[in-house]
């Protein structure tokens, strides 16, 4: 279970792929679309509010003991909207929702080589946010394989201003 209901920390950052393409969010027909694209030099990167939560990680060796903590994150590019995993459609979508957020909005954070991170679905272990055909999608990764596959690697560039939502 997630410890407490408030995040341990928050940060405002832009999100890009391993290949330095930007993740952007556009309002179309009253719903948000998520794009993966090369940004024109003068275009500002979209900001995402990342809220980090700690969850107790149960120990399988010591029965009901606790090994440590799982670091989970929610991603919100604009007020009241959060990235969510749609496991049935293998898609990543932006949904308006109220707190408490559904489990589909939580992703286990992994840090990887090259100062990249990966986002694993809380609701579907082994499934990560990835890039497919210039969109974000859910990609199944075999744990025995190298999790460094580039399409699930993302870079976070923190924006040094107070962690308020932008509008």
């Amino acid at each position: 279970s997630i410890t407490g209901i408030s995040p341990i920390t928050e940060s405002l950052a832009s999100l890009s792929t391993y290949n330095d393409q930007s993740i952007t969010f556009a309002l179309e027909d009253e719903s948000y679309e998520i794009y993966v694209e090369d940004l024109k030099k003068d275009k500002k990167k979209d900001k995402v509010l990342l809220s980090y939560y700690e969850s107790q990680h149960p120990s399988s060796e010591s029965g009901d003991g606790v090994d440590g903590k799982m670091l989970m994150v929610t991603l919100s590019p604009t007020k009241d909207f959060w990235l969510q995993a749609n496991n049935k459609e293998h898609s990543v979508e932006l949904h308006k929702c109220e707190k408490p957020l559904p489990d589909q909005a939580f992703f286990v954070l992994h840090n990887r080589s090259f100062n990249c991170v990966s986002f694993e679905c809380k609701t579907d272990p082994g499934v990560f946010i990835g890039v497919k055909d210039n969109h974000l999608a859910l990609i199944k990764v075999d744990y025995s394989e190298n999790l460094g596959s580039e399409n699930i690697l993302f870079k976070l560039s923190e924006i040094l201003e107070h962690h308020h939502h932008h509008h």
């Epitope: 341990i8 920390t9 940060s11 980090y52 700690e54 990680h57 120990s59 399988s60 060796e61 010591s62 090994d67 440590g68 903590k69 799982m70 670091l71 286990v108 954070l109 992994h110 840090n111 990887r112 080589s113 100062n115 694993e120 744990y143 025995s144 394989e145 190298n146 999790l147 460094g148 923190e158 040094l160």
Partner: antibody, heavy 122, light 107 residues
């Protein structure tokens, strides 16, 4: 109870090799990022290398890149550090450390071994 | 690489004193900072993670604060067992880096 026990340290000549091991118990070893941190005599702490739970992702300090290799055997709950082309400046106590966070080093290291001394000298 | 600068390098204090140690990062690290205590001949012990979260089993007289580039560790009332060396560590990006340490000595 979480335990990390390092072994494999000793005296080695410059240019030589050593393989350090860290035997882990008391936690789900394969779930955690593991790291090596070293401390030269009378000096501060220096991070050396980290490896993800499944071994698929590794990171190294520039000072050891190309000379040291981190690996793990999850079936034996053991972490390794293969050290080649050793230099006098590699002389230090080497600690094996478990990340507090399962899949990330963002939360620091909550358990450390007792350390094993590596001395590089002719 | 992110440089971590700790100050002071040493401090002399008495039991019951309030002690504050600062750590500056050469660039922003959000809240990804840990504090450790190390006693001679022993391994470091995690005190604080994510800048201000108290690690399980650590006495509440230890507290951490800060974000971005400036962080502090405070011991509200120094106890005999607190005389040790304290290190900050940025956990924001590789290579992970430690401050140079602050030795808390008996006055």
């Amino acid at each position: 109870e979480v335990q990390l026990v390092e072994s494999g340290g000793g005296l080695v000549q410059p240019g030589g090799s050593l393989r350090l091991s860290c035997a882990a118990s008391g936690f789900t070893f394969s779930s955690y990022v593991m790291s090596w941190v070293r401390q030269a005599p009378g000096k501060g702490l220096e991070w050396v290398s980290s490896i993800s739970g499944n071994g698929g992702s590794t990171n190294y300090a520039d000072s050891v890149k190309g000379r040291f290799t981190i690996s793990r055997d999850n079936s034996k709950n053991t972490l390794f550090l293969e050290m080649n082309s050793l230099r006098a400046e590699d002389t230090a106590v080497y600690y094996c450390a478990k990340s507090l966070g399962t899949t990330t080093t963002f939360l620091g290291f909550d358990y450390w071994g007792q350390g094993t001394l590596v001395t590089v000298s002719s | 690489d992110i440089q971590m600068t700790q100050s002071p390098s040493s401090v002399s204090a008495s039991v019951g004193d309030r002690v504050t140690i600062t750590c500056r990062a050469s660039q922003g690290i959000s809240s990804w900072l840990a504090w450790y205590q190390q006693k001679p001949g022993k391994a470091p012990k995690l005190l604080i993670y994510a800048a201000s979260s108290l690690q399980s089993g650590v006495p509440s007289r230890f507290s951490g604060s800060g974000s971005g580039t400036y962080f502090t560790l405070t011991i509200s009332s120094l106890q005999p067992e607190d005389f040790a060396t304290y290190y900050c560590q940025q956990a924001n990006s590789f290579p992970l880096t430690f401050g140079g340490g602050t030795k808390v000595e008996i006055k």
